[in-house]
């Protein structure tokens, strides 16, 4: 990940002193109320405090900033806009804030945002244009680097009628604005698909982490653009096959390292190509540790020790032979 | 974390020599690793490079004499030298680049190779 | 080839001066921004001071900063202090069909007055 400054000698602001003081223009450089800071380290802090709100009053100074264990709730357009604008902020971890709502333009006048982190918040509603600021066809691009989006689904009960993947897939292709993302990480949301265009959107990522979800297929995503992929990330789905297509295109893919750990992979006929390639291949890492969860006969079975023998499908029987 | 390398001294022009660079701390295999050496009181040049899964680029007028390799059992990256001059003098440095910007962000201390007769 | 031209190739200057030294690629860097900055003292390997064109480096002083985008850039240290005194070297990274290339520039030493 990106080299960020760890925090030394931080100063606490006293929240007696910050209140008494509210109604004046905040000085320079202080420190928020519940924030530590450093301004050697040219960060703060704002950690398990339960704010409700981010502090108006932020260092100008600031380039990692923490807000993490918070109760946000909602990020605003402008929630960062300041004046003069925090021009050096970085890196921005908001994880676990509960936060369920990100509006449009949340991220705006923060020109320096190379990493954001929004993992651990039950994001019922974020909007197509939290990442690009604007509706309009093409955005300005966005200074984004890296995106955590781990475990931002929210509890089903509480999911808009729309689809969840759809839903942050809009915010990430919403007028190309991402299109310098280099690492995008979607780990823990229960996906159950990938739609198709994402991929091809997203041109310049090196690593994609889409472990943990509930993936089944890979056959309509696309990796072809993805010339600069490094690694990524599929452990812990739903992954009953890979097919030709995506396994040539896998290969195809200079520096691609795949991570298949812990999917249910069905071992019968359809699983003679991918058995043939993971025996050639050098993308799949730890490859010998896949195994097969079906059928029943073949559970356990490691992948690269098969052959085309153990590979059948049962006959379909005619409907007058079937039974239920 | 740290890269140190070894196998630097004294060789023949014509010769041929294979430098070390040992990582500890990290994964090798995780990391695209670059070779680059400075001539005494010269400048910074860029021999080549070896991506994660180890897939190989070079400045132009090192390919065809100089390889990068890498062992990832024994987390060493290596720099195979053949044909040497007394132009290729200098000391070899080994960097590690970062896993998202390319800049090299971690740098061993250098070994010297001297092409003499 | 790509070529990073540096300039000026030496200067001197006092404790407390803003120094600048620009550096020009002869084509446009990865992604336009893949340019870095490094400051090397004499016996010792380089060490990063900017990356990403602006981005400063972990444990890097904040009188150091870095500009630019494309083909020209600029770094400039606002105001010099003792242990500044060393040489400055930029690093751009280049792809192509054919792939990856590096370069440095020539460097930029920077002298006591």
């Known amino acids: 990940s990106s080299p960020t400054s760890s925090a030394s000698s931080f100063s606490s602001s006293a929240p007696f002193l910050a209140s008494a003081v509210s109604a004046q223009p905040p000085l320079p450089d202080q420190c928020p109320a519940l924030c530590e800071c450093s301004e050697a380290a040219r960060t703060v802090k704002c950690v398990n405090r339960n704010l409700t709100e981010v502090p108006t009053d932020l260092p100008a100074y600031v380039r990692n900033l923490f807000l993490t264990g918070n109760q946000l709730a909602v990020l605003p357009a402008g929630a960062f806009a300041r004046r003069p604008p925090l021009a050096e902020l970085a890196a921005l971890n908001l994880s676990g804030s509960r936060l369920d709502e990100v509006r449009a333009g949340a991220f705006e006048h923060l020109p320096s945002l190379r990493q954001l982190d929004l993992s651990h918040n039950p994001l019922a509603d974020l909007s197509p244009f939290a990442f690009s600021g604007s509706n309009a066809s093409v955005s300005a691009p966005s200074p984004l680097v890296e995106l955590i989006l781990n475990h931002i689904v929210p509890p089903e009960d509480e999911r808009q009628n729309r689809s969840f993947e759809g839903m942050v897939v809009a915010a990430l292709l919403a007028g190309r604005a991402l299109q310098g993302l280099r690492r995008l990480e979607l780990a823990s949301n229960h996906f159950l698909y990938l739609p198709r265009d994402v991929l091809a959107q997203l041109p310049s990522l090196r690593h994609l982490d889409l472990s943990n979800n509930s993936l089944v297929s890979l056959t309509y995503v696309s990796f072809r653009n993805l010339t600069h992929l490094e690694s990524l990330h599929l452990e812990d789905n739903a992954l009953k096959v890979l097919h030709n297509g995506t396994l040539a295109e896998l290969q195809g893919l200079p520096h691609i390292r795949v991570f298949l750990d812990n999917n249910p992979w069905v071992c019968d006929c359809h699983m003679a190509d991918m058995v043939t390639w993971l025996k050639e291949t050098e993308v799949v890492q730890g490859k010998d540790r896949l195994t097969c969860a079906y059928p029943e006969k073949m559970r356990n079975r490691v992948l690269l020790e098969l052959n085309s023998a153990d590979l059948d499908c049962d006959p379909i029987l005619p409907p007058s032979l079937q039974t239920s | 974390q740290s890269v140190e390398e070894s196998g630097g001294g004294l060789v023949q022009p014509g010769g041929s020599l294979r430098l070390s660079c040992a990582a500890s701390?990290?994964?090798?295999?995780?990391?695209?690793m670059s070779w680059v050496r400075q001539a005494c009181g010269k400048g910074l040049e860029w021999i080549g490079i070896?991506?994660?899964?180890?897939?190989?680029y070079y400045a132009s007028w090192a390919k065809g004499r100089f390889t990068i390799s890498r062992d990832n059992s024994k987390n060493t990256l290596y720099l195979q030298m053949n044909s040497l001059r007394a132009e290729d003098t200098a000391v070899y440095y080994c960097a590690r680049v970062s896993s998202i910007y390319y800049t090299f962000n971690l740098w061993g201390q250098g070994t010297l190779v001297t092409v003499s007769s | 080839a790509q070529v990073l031209t540096q300039s000026p190739s030496s200067l001197s200057a006092s404790v407390g001066d803003r120094v600048t030294i620009t550096c020009q690629s002869s084509q446009s860097v990865y992604s336009n921004n893949e340019l870095s900055w490094y400051q090397q003292k004499p016996g010792k390997a380089p060490k990063l001071l900017i990356y990403y064109a602006s981005t400063l480096a972990s444990g890097v002083p904040s009188r150091f900063s870095g500009s630019g985008s494309g083909t020209d850039f600029t770094l400039t240290i606002s105001s010099l202090q003792p242990e500044d005194f060393a040489t400055y070297y930029c690093q751009g990274s280049y792809y192509s069909g054919s792939g990856w290339y590096y370069a440095f520039g020539g460097g930029t030493k920077v002298e006591i007055k």
């Open positions: 070896i991506a994660g899964r180890g897939s190989t």
């Open positions: 701390g990290f994964s090798l295999s995780s990391y695209w």
